[in-house]
Interface confidence: low
């Protein structure tokens, strides 16, 4: 499985590095964290324990999505 990979970027255009996920059962993982009054920070990569999640906090919001096709 091929996934985009990046850590704490502010744009998808900075998340175009490709990671080869070689462990069976891995999925592509995307985390978007938005702090109030700040830009959204994006992280992507391979995850063995990916679970879709969305949480609202007093100071912002976190959203995690999972997918299992190449470069999804």
């Amino acid at each position: 499985l091929l996934c985009y990979s990046c850590k704490a970027q502010v744009s998808n255009e900075d998340c175009l590095q490709v990671e080869n996920c070689t462990q069976l059962g891995e999925q592509c993982w995307t985390a978007r964290i938005r702090a109030v009054g700040l830009l959204t920070v994006i992280s992507k990569g391979c995850s063995l324990n990916c679970v879709d999640d969305s949480q609202d906090y007093y100071v912002g919001k976190k959203n995690i999505t999972c997918c299992d096709t190449d470069l999804c």
Epitope: N20, L24, Q27
Partner: antibody
Framework: QVQLQQWGAGLLKPSETLSLTCAVY????????WSWIRQPPGKGLEWIGE???????NYNPSLKSRVTISVDTSKNQFSLKLSSVTAADTAVYYC???????????WGQGTLVTVSS | DIVMTQSPLSLPVTPGEPASISCRSS???????????LVWYLQKPGQSPQLLIY???IRASGVPDRFSGSGSGTDFTLKISRVEAEDVGVYYC?????????FGQGTRLEIK
């Protein structure tokens, strides 16, 4: 097509160091873990340890004090060293692609290493 | 360490007949992601092992459909629907879920 070709000394004396190298041809070297597995004559398979392209390793605790697995990404090769060998280390040693959370889908041809005084 | 136990250790089979090999693990191989981390190999005489089944039930590329894997948790089975002469060898189960990776002791399939 991925091919693994291995080589190293086949006859050792007790207390010497076993040294084997495995060259990988084809496929992605950096995107995989690479393992060493051994099989004593007429017996089952024993996993020795694994390494990835960046040098991160996991070893079998039963052998950890004597084992070193290293990698040379410039040559797409990885190596096994096993120190202070005894007759109990006599086995066919295999290199293979794969490791934790994965399967071994490509194997080397195997190298019989005999430890005898 | 996770201990893998196979049975039987020897399996004489008549060509064309089915065969079944059991593999039990001392701990569950079912990961929280829903996959069972159980792998089957066949080692033919004088050869390196070859991959048959991974994730408990998925046939590797090029493996005939007479081979099938099933089971979950700690109990797994490899079935050959109709044994052929070329199936002779030693079958191993393996768990890659936890290091050290461990193998079963092997089941030797022979033709009657």
């Amino acid at each position: 097509q991925v091919q693994l070709q291995q080589w190293g000394a086949g006859l050792l004396k007790p207390s010497e160091t076993l040294s084997l190298t495995c060259a990988v041809y084809g496929g992605s070297f950096s995107g995989n873990y690479w393992s060493w597995i051994r099989q004593p004559p007429g017996k089952g398979l024993e996993w020795i340890g694994e390494i990835n392209h960046s040098g991160s390793t996991n070893y079998n605790p039963s052998l950890k004090s004597r084992v070193t697995i290293s990698v040379d990404t410039s040559k797409n090769q990885f190596s096994l060293k096993l120190s202070s060998v005894t007759a109990a280390d006599t086995a066919v040693y295999y290199c293979a692609r794969g490791g934790s959370y994965n399967y071994f889908d490509y194997w080397g041809q195997g190298t019989l290493v005999t430890v005898s005084s | 360490d996770i201990v893998m136990t196979q049975s039987p250790l020897s399996l004489p089979v008549t060509p064309g007949e089915p065969a079944s090999i059991s593999c039990r693990s001392s701990q569950s191989l079912l990961h929280s992601n829903g996959y069972n981390y159980l792998v089957w190999y066949l080692q033919k005489p004088g050869q390196s092992p070859q991959l048959l089944i991974y994730l408990g039930s998925i046939r590797a590329s090029g493996v005939p459909d007479r081979f099938s894997g099933s089971g979950s948790g700690t109990d797994f089975t490899l079935k050959i629907s109709r044994v052929e002469a070329e199936d002779v060898g030693v079958y191993y189960c393996m768990q890659p879920l936890q290091t050290p990776i461990t193998f079963g002791q092997g089941t030797r399939l022979e033709i009657k």
